[in-house]
């Protein structure tokens, strides 16, 4: 339905508060370096303009597209050239090229200072002094650091952030109340950002068809009682929502997401029995709840798939005359029967099935050719099962920190060209799969683990894309979205890598390490471990373990010393010499 003024339409649909929040998120995700005050000023100007359009949709410029209005506003920023360099060239373009240009300049790893959490009393004072500014600042800081954060979900995080301060700033022990909540929001926020980044990468790098296939598989697992037409409708609507958010169309995205939640709740009887509680919640909570809802029970009386997709002699006729419906139905039927499989595995099976039909339907005896297609699935299913079993055993044996270290070594040897901070970040996240998924029973391990690994490896892919240094990473990231994890798993030690020159400075530590949190201290040690492997990629596990044990003992000893700095200087030299000898550097 066409509206005379798109901006008025969205303002009315979303309400002023959400409108302003979403415009702030949009601007902060595009201009990630701009100061908070500048963004607030731009948002206020856009909001005032939107109000004039609500009053009179025929007013000047009210008929312009949101991209035109927002782009024009962004291009008024005086310091665009100095701050963003070539991004300023976007402003010379016309829509839709200008928006595409802004999108291409989104930075997954912006050069921004780490967010340091102030003292609780300081935060509570700021919250009470100006609640609105405090919450806007939260949106701004998250959005600029996570330029693909799912905007309507960020509104939900902001609501929880506000609730935490409202409750805890009047608690007897403010810190005990607030800090765990903030930690939880931070961790959930990082996870949410990474999950959405994969959705956007899927759409942008592999196209709508890839995203729709992912959505068919996931929604069929989640709503196995829903019929194919229902799942297809949800997939179409969900694809529109994510295409809009990934494309910077945040007002449309939030509006359409609300409509989708409304539709799902109005039709929950034909979708899932698990939606009742979600649908009783207010909008933001409702949408979040639906997105996280547990899988419904599988319907009774599902016959074997082999009859329709393998045993029938008419498979090729059905495939040839209705390719997308036939393959979509295959994926839907397979996924609803297999909540125990990861989405990426289901997509690999569907791709194998499609490839087999492409080959066999051109053969002399098609039925004979595709008759054993389900046998080809067996190794594809067993590969992630075995990998998860082995890695969960290793995790249970080592614990999270040492498991992360094992992965750090493994991945540094595979792709030693990748920057140390990226290897540390990605390997630490890969290692979290253990505590996240290994506790689950067999039936839930694979969907938990492999789909989580897809999210983490996508982080590696987007960070590497910014500054490509490894052909092997590029190859695994670009060849096939669903085969990324098997591609990385299959990488052996990079024999072409020339070891990094030894630099004593890299292994020089100071007393400041003693005041770091346990997590920060781990990161320091893991950074050193990556550097060790880069210097000595052929080092054995035993050699590396010995050096790391010595290093841990050295840090512990010097942090207990009276003169810490002298200890770090003197003992550090000895440690470097001993390590060099142990590793033959």
């Amino acid at each position: 339905d066409a509206h005379k003024s798109e901006v008025a339409h969205r303002f009315k649909d979303l309400g002023e508060e959400n409108f302003k929040a979403l415009v702030l998120i949009a601007f902060a995700q595009y201009l990630q370096q701009c100061p908070f005050e500048d963004h607030v000023k731009l948002v206020n100007e856009v909001t005032e303009f939107a109000k004039t359009c609500v009053a009179d949709e025929s007013a000047e410029n009210c008929d312009k597209s949101l991209h035109t209005l927002f782009g024009d506003k962004l291009c008024t920023v005086a310091t665009l050239r100095e701050t963003y360099g070539e991004m300023a060239d976007c402003c010379a373009k016309q829509e839709p090229e200008r928006n595409e240009c802004f999108l291409q300049h989104k930075d997954d790893n912006p050069n921004l200072p780490r967010l340091v959490r102030p003292e609780v009393d300081v935060m509570c004072t700021a919250f009470h002094d100006n609640e609105e500014t405090f919450l806007k600042k939260y949106l701004y800081e998250i959005a600029r650091r996570h330029p693909y954060f799912y905007a309507p979900e960020l509104l939900f995080f902001a609501k929880r952030y506000k609730a935490a301060f409202t409750e805890c700033c009047q608690a007897a022990d403010k810190a005990a109340c607030l800090l765990p909540k903030l930690d939880e929001l931070r961790d959930e926020g990082k996870a949410s950002s990474a999950k959405q980044r994969l959705k956007c990468a899927s759409l942008q790098k592999f196209g709508e068809r890839a995203f729709k296939a992912w959505a068919v598989a996931r929604l069929s697992q989640r709503f196995p009682k829903a019929e194919f037409a229902e799942v297809s409708k949800l997939v179409t609507d969900l694809t529109k929502v994510h295409t809009e958010c990934c494309h910077g169309d945040l007002l449309e995205c939030a509006d359409d997401r609300a409509d989708l939640a409304k539709y799902i709740c109005e039709n929950q009887d034909s979708i899932s029995s698990k939606l009742k509680e979600c649908c009783e919640k207010p909008l933001l909570e409702k949408s979040h709840c639906i997105a996280e809802v547990e899988n419904d029970e599988m319907p009774a009386d599902l016959p074997s798939l082999a009859a329709d997709f393998v045993e029938s002699k008419d498979v090729c006729k059905n495939y040839a005359e209705a390719k997308d419906v036939f393959l979509g139905m295959f994926l839907y039927e397979y996924a609803r029967r297999h909540p125990d499989y990861s989405v990426v595995l289901l997509l690999r099976l569907a791709k194998t099935y499609e490839t087999t039909l492409e080959k066999c339907c051109a053969a002399a005896d098609p039925h004979e050719c595709y008759a054993k297609v389900f046998d080809e699935f067996k190794p594809l299913v067993e590969e992630p099962q075995n990998l998860i079993k082995q890695n969960c055993e290793l995790f249970e044996q080592l614990g999270e920190y040492k498991f992360q270290n094992a992965l750090l070594v493994r991945y540094t040897k595979k792709v030693p060209q990748v920057s140390t901070p990226t290897l540390v970040e990605v390997s630490r996240n890969l290692g979290k799969v253990g505590s996240k998924c290994c506790k689950h029973p067999e039936a839930k391990r694979m969907p938990c683990a492999e789909d989580y690994l897809s999210v983490v490896l996508n982080q590696l892919c987007v960070l590497h894309e910014k500054t490509p240094v490894s052909d092997r990473v590029t190859k695994c990231c670009t060849e096939s979205l669903v085969n990324r994890r098997p591609c990385f798993s299959a990488l052996e030690v990079d024999e072409t890598y020339v070891p990094k020159e030894f630099n004593a400075e890299t292994f020089t530590f100071h007393a400041d390490i003693c005041t770091l949190s346990e997590k920060e201290r781990q990161i320091k040690k893991q950074t050193a471990l990556v550097e060790l492997v880069k210097h000595k990629p052929k080092a054995t596990k035993e050699q590396l373990k010995a050096v790391m044990d010595d290093f841990a003992a050295f840090v512990e000893k010097c942090c207990k010393a009276d003169d810490k700095e002298t200890c770090f200087a003197e003992e550090g030299k000895k440690l470097v010499a001993a390590s060099q000898a142990a590793l033959g550097l």
Epitope: A307, E311, N318, V325
Partner: antibody, heavy 120, light 107 residues
Framework: EVQLVESGGGRVQPGGSLRLSCAAS????????MNWVRQAPGKCLEWIGH???????YYATWAKGRFTISRDNSKNTVYLQMNSLRAEDTATYFC??????????????WGQGTQVTVSS | FELTQSPSSLSASVGDRVTITCQAS??????LAWYQQKPGQPPKLLIY???DLTSGVPSRFSGSGSGTDFTLTISSLQPEDFATYYC??????????FGCGTKLTVL
């Protein structure tokens, strides 16, 4: 409630035509292969044909040419067009839902049937 | 393919164990269903994929077989079980075939 309701049956002269309808409620026809099955008085069940989710129709050998199955997803209805009717086409005509979009069986959901009588 | 059901009629008493067979003219793997039909009603699905019991159907009904030879067994006949039983073969192509039925009556 999930159900199928057939209509359009009645008495027709030999050589005449009839179009039967099967209206679905509680589910979307487009998700399933929809079948027509008939049963002459005191006789066996006889499969006529189906239209699958890809809109491809298949027929029993004896039904090809005289019988045509189609559907209108917007009306959530499947049709059976019967031409050149003969006395031996007298039967109860059932509509039945396949297990999936490309399934030829089994049929868990059936309509109550509509009676067709061909006689002069 | 064709399906041959036997016997075409059968008389039995409440509590009896009853077996009906269905033979396919060619292999249909396990793609066979069994239906129960009572006068004036549409058929009701009892068993699919040769041996899987449809939800809500009493466990006294069971199916077995694969390839060309299939069996429906009622372990202990109840009064409501007197009806006509049909087998259906499916899956080998986009066509399907019914057997001609076995009428089960009270002895």
């Amino acid at each position: 409630e999930v159900q199928l309701v057939e209509s359009g049956g009645g008495r027709v002269q030999p050589g005449g035509s009839l179009r039967l309808s099967c209206a679905a409620s509680g589910f979307s026809l487009s998700s399933y292969a929809m079948n027509w099955v008939r049963q002459a008085p005191g006789k066996c069940l006889e499969w006529i044909g189906h239209i699958n989710a890809g809109d491809i129709a298949y027929y029993a050998t004896w039904a090809k040419g005289r019988f045509t199955i189609s559907r209108d997803n917007s009306k959530n209805t499947v049709y059976l067009q019967m031409n050149s009717l003969r006395a031996e086409d007298t039967a109860t005509y059932f509509c039945a839902r396949g297990a999936g979009g490309f399934s030829t069986g089994p049929f868990k959901l059936w309509g109550q049937g509509t009676q067709v009588t061909v006689s002069s | 393919f064709e399906l041959t059901q036997s016997p075409s009629s059968l008389s039995a008493s409440v509590g009896d164990r009853v077996t009906i067979t269905c033979q396919a003219s060619e292999s249909i793997n396990s793609r066979l269903a069994w239906y129960q039909q009572k006068p004036g009603q549409p058929p009701k699905l009892l068993i699919y994929d040769a041996s899987d019991l449809t939800s809500g159907v009493p466990s006294r009904f069971s199916g077995s077989g694969s390839g060309t030879d299939f069996t429906l067994t009622i372990s202990s006949l109840q009064p409501e079980d007197f009806a006509t039983y049909y087998c259906q073969g499916y899956g080998g192509s986009s066509t399907t075939t019914f057997g001609c039925g076995t009428k089960l009556t009270v002895l």
